[in-house]
């Protein structure tokens, strides 16, 4: 069949009909509906929302909508024994205590079940000791402390400011440094933009606002008790001592009013340089311990949270493909929130809801996509990407054989300045072509394309006249699809101006103040940015599901592979003598990249010329495109990270949110000058070059003529 047999509307009209059906007003209504009460993973409220979405997706016209449940490890504060931090005097008396909850925003004073700020999966404990300020608690911050300043964190409670890297990496670094507790806080330098009022009068973080979040180091494992397998009714669960990624020391988050009280007394070493100073009126002394008059005072943590196996629910909707029903294009985003989820995740969930409604409308008019579209409302993303990972573990055999693409749909906005896209290079041309067809919502770009405003505001650092597209990292539900299964993936949202706004994320991230009103009053009153994001996400899904030839360009992978090879070689070149001593050569990698480039070029030529009316040849060429991302998967995974299997990309070992290229080689080279056995260390570099070169060459060969 040709794809037109599946439809009573011409292909070009299909896309237009789909996009025209998307309405800002609907997204606004859906956002309001999803944000009136908290929807914390594992709660009755979130189960009820799952059933509501299931019902509405059925009404919208999907062929089937099912709930997929799993019993996973979650973490909650103890309702009768709250978490807090104290300053204690020499007699052990608590002379200062941090707040037990965030002051609720106007209109929400009587809402029940607002979970107080906590660090999910913190163990219980009441450590007391001297404080050390560790800046952002990045790898380089601990290098500065330990190597340059000779400050020992062993047996200390460290206080770190949020921002720059994933909080789980901060906790891991603190543990490795020997700390016995971690206090995380939001510094106004990172979460209070100058010239903007704090909520409810603006979008800045008030002093009593606190960022919640999990502090796991799962490395893609999913449920900590069932790594690699679904947490179903007959699952074998590990004991808590063998669980994956749990922190070993108590951790707790606070706002900047409370942080001020802790930091203002700090003594010991002065901050090493201005990059260690935030915006509070405190010296930012590193410590250890308090200054002069307060030197006998200590800090004590009181953490009583519990880990509990709890049922979670994904909603999975199916729109069956008319021509290739066994090829899946997936649009997924999470539903669970820390509190109201005004931005994270419901600004994304509202967009998914409207995309489903638009597809459903076309289906009711007799249209079907060429390929099957799966829609997912994931649960427990905030607790470690659990819902998406468990579902993918359960369905891995289907996904690895049938998965064409995964488009993520968490928060639609983190600002209102310009578009932000992270995706596989296979999708670069799809994104470029789509955004050229969409109208820009930006002021000053009336009548111009989204591509034009995006390129102007966020230019590519490498290619003039093109927009920046970033590498996929992690910290969201695409992780299992891309990093573990090798399914081509992408994400898009509206973002801030990174040049002028240096704060991390958006100020009210994961706080009680992330409300519907935050979005409606301050970020997107007309919901025009939400609509644009719906058009980008929905347009990508539409093209991936409906184009006769998959809209993947393998030549773009060739370009970035050369760039990544150059980058990793440049890092290695900082050790020229060792490269000579241990005969370290990157020639095999560059040779493989050259072969990939030539084969990809020939494949693209064949793609232009083949007979698209021959369904067997069409399917064959499409399968080569679909399986190209899969070819970058190493079944053995990366060292000590078995669920990160993509050889070209992995989440950075120092920041889960960031993507790293050739991560195996990168990690082998990282801090190599400090390794006790240089011969062994450089041997591992050589092994990782070998793995990367082999993988690139093997991937190239999947694009060769089949016989």
């Amino acid at each position: 069949k040709s794809s037109n047999e599946a439809t009573n509307i011409t292909p070009k009209h299909n896309m237009k009909a789909f996009l025209d059906e998307l309405k800002a007003e609907n997204i606004k209504k859906f956002l309001y509906n999803f944000t009136q009460i908290p929807h914390l993973a594992g709660t009755e409220q979130n189960f009820q929302l799952a059933k509501q979405i299931q019902s509405q997706w059925k009404e919208f016209g999907l062929d089937s909508v099912e709930l997929a449940h799993y019993d996973v490890l979650l973490s909650y504060p103890n309702k009768t024994h709250p978490n807090y931090i104290s300053i204690i005097n020499e007699d052990g008396n608590e002379i200062f205590n941090t707040s037990l909850f965030e002051p609720p925003p106007p209109g929400y004073e009587n809402v029940s079940d607002i979970v107080p700020p906590f660090s999910a999966f913190s163990p219980q404990g009441m450590p007391e000791g001297d404080l050390v300020y560790v800046n952002y608690a990045r790898t380089e911050d601990f290098f500065k402390l330990e190597r340059d300043m000779k400050i020992n964190c062993s047996g200390k409670i460290v206080i770190a400011r949020y921002g720059k890297v994933f909080r789980g990496n901060k906790v891991k670094n603190a543990q490795l440094a020997g700390a016995k507790g971690v206090i995380l806080y939001s510094d106004p330098a990172d979460y209070f933009a100058p010239g903007v009022k704090s909520y409810p009068d603006g979008w800045n973080l008030p002093g009593g606002g606190v960022q919640r979040g999990n502090i796991l180091n799962l490395n893609g494992a999913g449920d900590p008790l069932t790594p690699g397998y679904p947490a179903n009714e007959y699952a074998y669960r590990r004991g808590i001592a063998e669980a994956v990624g749990l922190p070993s020391i108590p951790v707790h988050p606070i706002g900047y009013y409370d942080a001020q009280k802790l930091l203002e007394k700090m003594g010991g070493s002065a901050p090493p340089d201005s990059s260690w100073r935030g915006s509070l009126k405190v010296p930012y002394n590193v410590g250890p311990g308090f200054t002069g008059n307060f030197s006998t005072q200590k800090v004590k943590m009181h953490i009583h949270s519990t880990n509990e196996v709890t049922r979670i629910y994904n909603v999975i909707g199916t729109l069956r493909g008319a021509v290739e029903p066994d090829r899946y294009v997936i649009l997924g985003g999470h539903r669970d929130s820390w509190v109201f989820g005004g931005i994270d995740p419901q600004s994304g969930a509202a967009v998914v809801h409207e995309i489903v409604r638009s597809f459903g409308t076309l289906k009711k008019e007799g249209w079907r996509p060429r390929r099957t579209i799966l829609f997912a409302s994931w649960d427990a993303e905030e607790f470690g990407l659990l819902g998406s990972t468990e579902w993918a573990e359960e369905n891995s055999r289907l996904l690895q054989e049938r998965g064409v693409a995964y488009i993520n749909a968490d928060s639609s906005i983190e600002g209102n300045y310009t578009l932000r896209v992270d995706c596989t290079p296979l999708m670069y041309s799809l994104v470029h072509n789509l955004t050229k067809e969409l109208k820009s919502p930006d002021e000053g770009f009336e009548g111009k394309s989204l591509y034009e405003s995006w390129t102007k505001k966020s230019p590519s650092p490498e290619f003039s006249g093109m927009p920046r597209i970033s590498k996929l990292g992690s910290g969201n539900d695409f992780e299992v699809f891309f990093q573990r299964l090798g399914i081509a993936s992408g994400r898009a949202r509206y973002t801030k101006n990174w040049e002028t706004n240096k704060f991390s994320g958006y100020p009210l991230y994961h706080s009680v103040y992330e409300t519907y009103e935050l979005v409606e009053k301050f970020y997107d009153p007309m919901f025009k940015y939400h609509l644009t994001v719906a058009q980008v996400r929905g347009g990508m899904v539409f093209e991936l599901a409906n184009s006769i030839v998959l809209p993947f360009d393998c030549r773009d992978y060739a370009v970035v592979l050369r760039k990544y090879a150059d980058k990793i070689y440049s890092i290695s070149m900082k050790h020229p003598q060792e490269m000579k001593t241990y005969s370290v050569s990157f020639d095999s990698l560059f040779s493989a990249v050259k072969n990939f480039t030539e084969i990809a070029s020939k494949f693209s030529e064949r793609l232009q010329d083949f007979d698209k009316s021959n369904p067997i040849v069409l399917r064959m060429m499409n399968d080569q495109l679909m399986f190209l991302e899969r070819a970058f998967i190493d079944p053995l995974g990366l060292p000590d990270r078995p669920f990160y299997r993509h050889v070209i990309y992995a989440p950075s070992s120092h920041n889960k949110y960031a993507g790293e290229s050739f991560p195996g080689i990168y990690d082998a080279l990282f801090d190599i000058e400090s390794k006790v056995d240089p011969s062994k260390a450089w041997g591992e570099v050589k092994r990782q070059i070998y793995v990367a070169a082999f993988t690139v060459q093997a991937a190239a060969e999947t694009l060769s003529e089949v016989a």
Epitope: P461, R562, D566, F590, S591
Partner: nanobody, 118 residues
């Protein structure tokens, strides 16, 4: 043939300046990065500096930061290393290293000797 040729070395007093050049033939500086590496007499190779792409970003070994500046002139297809406030410990043979955008193996120049002595 792809080759890199360094020039500009010589004998100079401590505190003075030198400018090294590295002319490329057979390929253009469209490659990702170009590097300067040095080898002091009787010592191993030491990385000195890297300049990326269009010359917008560069990195230096700690011992030369604030004294050395790497730059590129794409029109002349030449890489430079401006060396100021030279010290005796900067005495070395300086090599430039790069890789043509289509080549598999890196290209090393033959080197130019810099001697810092009073």
């Amino acid at each position: 043939e792809v080759q890199l040729v360094e020039s500009g070395g010589g004998v100079v007093q401590p505190g003075r300046s030198l400018r090294l050049s590295c002319a490329a033939s057979g390929f253009t500086f469209s490659s990702y990065a170009m590097h300067w590496v040095r080898q002091a007499p009787g010592k191993g190779l030491e990385w000195v500096a890297t300049i990326y792409q269009d010359g917008s970003e560069s990195e230096y070994v700690d011992s030369v930061k604030g004294r050395f500046t790497v730059s590129i002139d794409n029109a002349k297809n030449t890489l430079y290393l401006q060396m100021d406030s030279l010290r005796a410990e900067d005495t070395a043979t300086y090599y430039c290293v790069g890789r043509a955008s289509t080549s598999i193996t890196p290209v090393w120049g033959l080197g130019t000797l810099v001697t810092v002595s009073s």
